[in-house]
């Protein structure tokens, strides 16, 4: 069987300072069964930044209909960026569980942040 | 057409086994997650066991008893029974999964059923 | 577990009028709700997704409103098809899924 592949297309993405930033993610397959999350970060100290499940996360939206069926298309906009929002940007897949085990993650995207435009 | 066929059902002692068999077509089979669910007669709706790739999950009921597995290569879905006892006894359904809300499940297909009876 | 708590149990409506009722759940499920049909001897049937969205193929007269712990379904001008079992099914939290106990729509 094909294993599951985890896709972010864009190495970088550069925004200015207020406007909105897309990232992009899709996956490979609807299985395993699992949610999808995003992260600033890697490792022990990364910051959950998107879980459509849990969390308020004002500034961040999901590209396509969240009640899409077998929606394979885990892109996020956060909007007002500012530079303190720079990173590196991961989406990650868990399997689900008790909890839930991370299953693979994407290369991941470096966002930066230019200022703003007078 | 989706279509889903169940099979292996009838009627077995306490303690014994069955093995359910359901015949999947109309779709990309080895692309969705696939589940059983019983219904005792006279009864409601019972959740029993969904296959992803390699995951798998079981209601504690039947947790230890019940082995879910498919053959991609085949497009059939399977579930074994062991230690059968008198409140297994249901009409089981294959179901197909659906996926929303980036990882929530329900059921878009639905077999017509097959009958297991555990009596002595 | 979450769960599900549908009423009434049973409910007796003439055709032609309308039909509601409910499903409760024990916790926050969010929009995380589908609705079944089944008919006598009859394996169920997607009507609703989403806790509103319908099944493509479902016709207008079912739809799915609520969100969070309280659910209804409706069914305007009840059709002879239309008497049967309604189940709800949450899929917020699992395992396990769960599903209500179930609304039998009966002929007044």
């Known amino acids: 069987e094909e294993e599951l592949q985890v896709i972010q297309p864009e190495k970088s993405v550069s925004v200015a300072a207020g406007d909105s930033a897309t990232l992009n993610c899709t996956v490979s397959s609807l299985i395993p069964v699992g949610p999808i999350q995003w992260f600033r970060g890697a490792g022990p100290g990364r910051e959950l930044i998107y879980n459509l499940k849990e969390g308020h996360f004002p500034r961040v939206t999901p590209v396509s209909d969240p009640t899409k069926r077998n929606n394979m298309d885990f892109s996020i906009r956060i909007s007002n960026i500012t530079p303190a929002d720079a990173g590196t940007y991961y989406c990650v897949k868990f399997r689900k569980g008790s909890p839930d085990v991370e299953l693979k993650s994407g290369a991941g995207t470096e966002l930066s942040v230019r200022a703003k435009p007078s | 057409e989706v279509q889903l066929l169940e099979s292996g059902g009838g009627v077995v002692q306490p303690g014994g086994s069955l093995r359910l068999s359901c015949a999947a077509s109309?779709?990309?089979?080895?692309?969705?997650?696939m589940t059983w669910v019983r219904q005792a007669p006279g009864e409601g709706l019972e959740w029993v066991s969904t296959i992803g790739s390699g995951d798998t999950y079981y209601a504690d009921s039947v947790k230890g008893r019940f082995t879910i597995s498919r053959d991609n290569s085949k497009n059939t879905l399977y579930l074994q029974m062991n230690s059968l006892r008198a409140e297994d006894t249901a009409v089981y359904y294959c179901?197909?999964?659906?996926?929303?809300?980036?990882?929530?499940?329900?059921?878009?297909?639905w077999g017509l059923g097959t009958l297991v009876t555990v009596s002595s | 577990e979450i769960v599900l708590t549908q009423s009434p149990a049973t409910l007796s409506v003439s055709p032609g009028e309308r039909a509601t009722f409910s499903c409760r759940a024990s916790?926050?499920?969010?929009?995380?709700l589908a609705w079944y049909q089944q008919r006598p001897g009859q394996a169920p049937r997607l009507l609703i997704y989403?806790?509103?969205i319908r099944e493509t193929g479902i016709p207008e007269r079912f739809s799915g409103s609520g969100s969070g712990t309280e659910f209804t379904l409706t069914i305007t001008s009840l059709q002879s098809e239309d008497f049967a079992v309604y189940y709800c099914q949450q899929y917020y939290d699992w395992p396990p899924f769960t599903f209500g106990g179930g609304t039998k729509v009966e002929i007044k």
């Open positions: 109309g779709f990309s089979f080895s692309n969705f997650a």
């Open positions: 989403a806790a509103r």
């Open positions: 179901a197909k999964d659906s996926t929303v809300s980036w990882s929530g499940d329900f059921f878009d297909y």
């Open positions: 916790q926050n499920v969010k929009n995380d």
